[in-house]
């Protein structure tokens, strides 16, 4: 990615040109990086520690899960140093409808860079995907599913809507938060959104550009429900079990609407993270802002993706792109300051510990170590036929 | 786990009314419809009623409406029956039973039963 | 409401031998390409227990010696081999219809 004077709008550090910010660790190695995944959980439940535990015990990882409360499924890392660091949070995606071939509703990528304080605590809810309506282990809506038994077409084309025989939308990815505590109140640095689920109809793709807000005077609301559940938003508060939870009220999927589960059973649950249930449409993305879900139960309406945030501390690397088919993540690496650099990007080189420019293509690094020149090109060598002839 | 568990025992006089419980535990208790079987001393089973906790949605045996009352508190995942009008017909063993996959599944937990006798 | 006819009322068997239990319904509980029928295990001073569902899925932890068969109208309940702890009462049932209704129940004993 090519971004200039990334640093400009910091309003907490101005980094000099080829400085990096001080370090506690003597020894900078950039391709240490922190990866948090779901730690196996799925659903509309975040993971415990025991499952943590288990994910991460190969690995340069140790968290602190949260076990009750809001914090329920949350896992608190400990930052190892004063650095810079880049974020990348990945939203999950939702879940397939009952005849919606199509590929998922993807989660959301969001990638920050931040100035991150020794010791600091991160809060990182990782969101899980939304679940699909289908395959089933429920031999009556395996048979929806593979097309044997059409009792919601029939109910659609007798009263042209579905009640009895509801269900079948995917349920909605949930969110990954990542956040700070400030006076034991949360302040989120990065939300990735969750994808909108899949409704249970087959039909065009409708594309809708991910969303990203960086004000956080801006409600972080629920998304609206209908009969699926609207997306978890920020610190909203909804009583409707199908609704996606906000990240002050734990975040937790949300369930199947009733009517699925009265008659048959199709559960379609929202993932953690605030992903709303899915019924006939399709369950909201959790998000700062929810995504919405149909104000009826249209068999042919998705639920819409969640909004993503970045925080205006750090700064916006990458923009809000979906890319995540399954669950959530969050990848945390030191970041390296490239601002110096003509293209804005390098690396550091293993042994030397320097810090080297890299060019476009077609362009060489000058000698000053910063710039790019056209390269040379070399004298033109006669073809060896006509040297021979 | 699964568990359903139901009050104990009842000794009521005739004419009068009994509230019975079940709490349940071990799963997502709004989501489930909860039923109510009936078995009198060496005799079958009989279905009374169902309640859906997630919204208070209730269907009745013809034979027992009137008879029964079936509520539900989410708060305390727990399903009542009221039996009222009492009659030695009444004297019997009552399980609540989980439907599994909606009411068109089939009866995957049962509590343990409570024992109602009916006697002057 | 469906009437659901068990046969036997009661029956003995060998320990190792086959037992056969029949269900007939006054009319057909296939909806779907699905038979709503249930069987379940009663033993005494117990709660019934959910074995076999729709006609002829084994539910999760009951042995493989117990199955089912049928549709519409006609089901049976197969034990082999018999074991003494098969001794119980059991019910077929069936949901297609409201309301659910079980039949009369059979009573299994070892020879």
């Known amino acids: 990615p090519k971004s200039r004077n990334l640093f400009e709008r910091n309003p907490n550090k101005e980094l000099k040109p080829g400085e990096n910010s001080p370090r506690q660790t003597p020894i900078f190695d950039p391709t240490v990086h922190w990866l948090f995944t779901t730690c196996g959980a799925s659903g509309p439940h975040g993971p415990t520690q025991a499952q943590c535990n288990n994910a991460y015990q190969n690995s340069n990882l140790s968290v602190e899960v949260g076990s009750e409360g809001p914090l329920k499924g949350i896992q608190i890392w400990k930052v190892p140093a004063t650095d810079t660091y880049s974020i990348s949070g990945y939203g999950a995606a939702g879940g397939k409808g009952g005849k919606n071939t199509m590929m998922r509703s993807h989660g959301v990528s969001v990638l920050g860079i931040f100035n991150l304080e020794k010791d600091d605590m991160l809060y990182i809810l990782v969101g899980q995907q939304g679940e699909d309506a289908c395959p089933s282990t429920n031999q009556l809506i395996q048979k929806v599913c593979i097309g044997e038994n059409n009792v919601i077409e029939e109910e659609i084309r007798v009263n042209r809507s579905v009640h009895e025989w509801a269900g079948g939308g995917g349920g909605g990815g949930g969110a990954t938060y990542v956040f700070k505590m400030k006076d034991g109140v949360p302040v989120p640095l990065i939300i990735a959104a969750g994808g909108g689920g899949r409704a249970y109809g087959a039909k065009t793709d409708t594309f809708h550009p991910e969303r990203l807000e960086n004000n956080s005077s801006v409600l972080g609301l629920n998304g609206n429900s209908g009969a699926a559940g609207g997306g978890g938003g920020w610190n909203d508060n909804t009583s409707l079990l199908w609704a996606g939870k906000s990240l002050q009220e734990g975040a937790t999927g949300g369930h199947s609407c009733p009517q699925a589960m009265k008659k048959w059973g199709w559960e379609t649950r929202g993932g953690f993270g605030g992903g709303g249930g899915g019924c006939s449409s399709g369950g909201g993305g959790g998000g700062y802002i929810g995504g919405n879900a149909a104000s009826n139960n249209d068999p042919e309406m998705d639920g819409e993706d969640g909004v993503s945030f970045i925080s205006p501390l750090g700064i916006l690397y990458t923009p809000a792109l979906k890319v995540m088919e399954g669950h959530g993540e969050v990848n945390i690496k030191h970041y390296l300051n490239c601002s110096h650099c003509e293209v804005d990007e390098c690396h550091m080189d293993p042994e030397s510990h320097k810090v080297i420019c890299f060019c476009d293509h077609g362009t060489v690094l000058a000698e000053d170590g910063v710039s790019c020149i056209v390269s040379p090109t070399p004298e033109p060598h006669l073809p060896l036929s006509l040297i021979l002839s | 786990q699964v568990q359903l568990q139901q009050s104990g025992a009842e000794l009521v006089k005739p004419g009068a009314s009994v509230k019975i419980s079940c709490k349940a535990s071990?799963?997502?208790?709004?989501?489930?419809?909860m039923n109510w079987v009936k078995q009198r001393p060496g005799k079958g089973l009989e279905w009374i009623g169902q309640i859906y906790p997630g919204d208070g949605d209730t269907t009745y045996n013809g034979k027992f409406k009137g008879k029964a009352t079936l509520t539900a508190d989410k708060s305390s995942s727990t399903v009542y029956m009221q039996l009222n009008s009492l009659t030695s017909e009444d004297s019997a063993v009552y399980f609540c039973?989980?439907?599994?996959?909606?009411?068109?599944?089939?009866?995957?937990?049962w509590g343990q039963g409570t024992t109602l006798t009916v006697s002057s | 409401d469906v009437q659901m006819i068990q046969t036997p009322d009661s029956l003995a068997v060998s320990l190792g031998q086959r037992a056969t239990i029949s269900c007939r319904a006054s009319?057909?509980?296939?909806?779907?390409?699905?038979?709503?029928m249930h069987w379940y295990q009663q033993k005494p001073g117990q709660s019934p227990k959910l074995l076999i569902y729709r006609a002829s899925n084994l539910e999760s932890g009951i042995p493989a010696r117990f199955s089912g068969s049928g549709s519409r109208t006609d089901f049976t309940l197969t034990i082999n081999p018999v074991e003494t702890d098969d001794v119980a009462t059991y019910y077929c049932q069936q949901n297609n219809k409201d309301p659910p209704t079980f039949g009369g129940g059979t009573k299994l004993e070892i020879k």
């Open positions: 071990g799963y997502a208790f709004s989501s489930y419809w």
């Open positions: 009319e057909s509980v296939d909806n779907y390409g699905i038979s709503f």
């Open positions: 039973v989980r439907y599994y996959y909606g009411s068109s599944g089939y009866f995957d937990y």
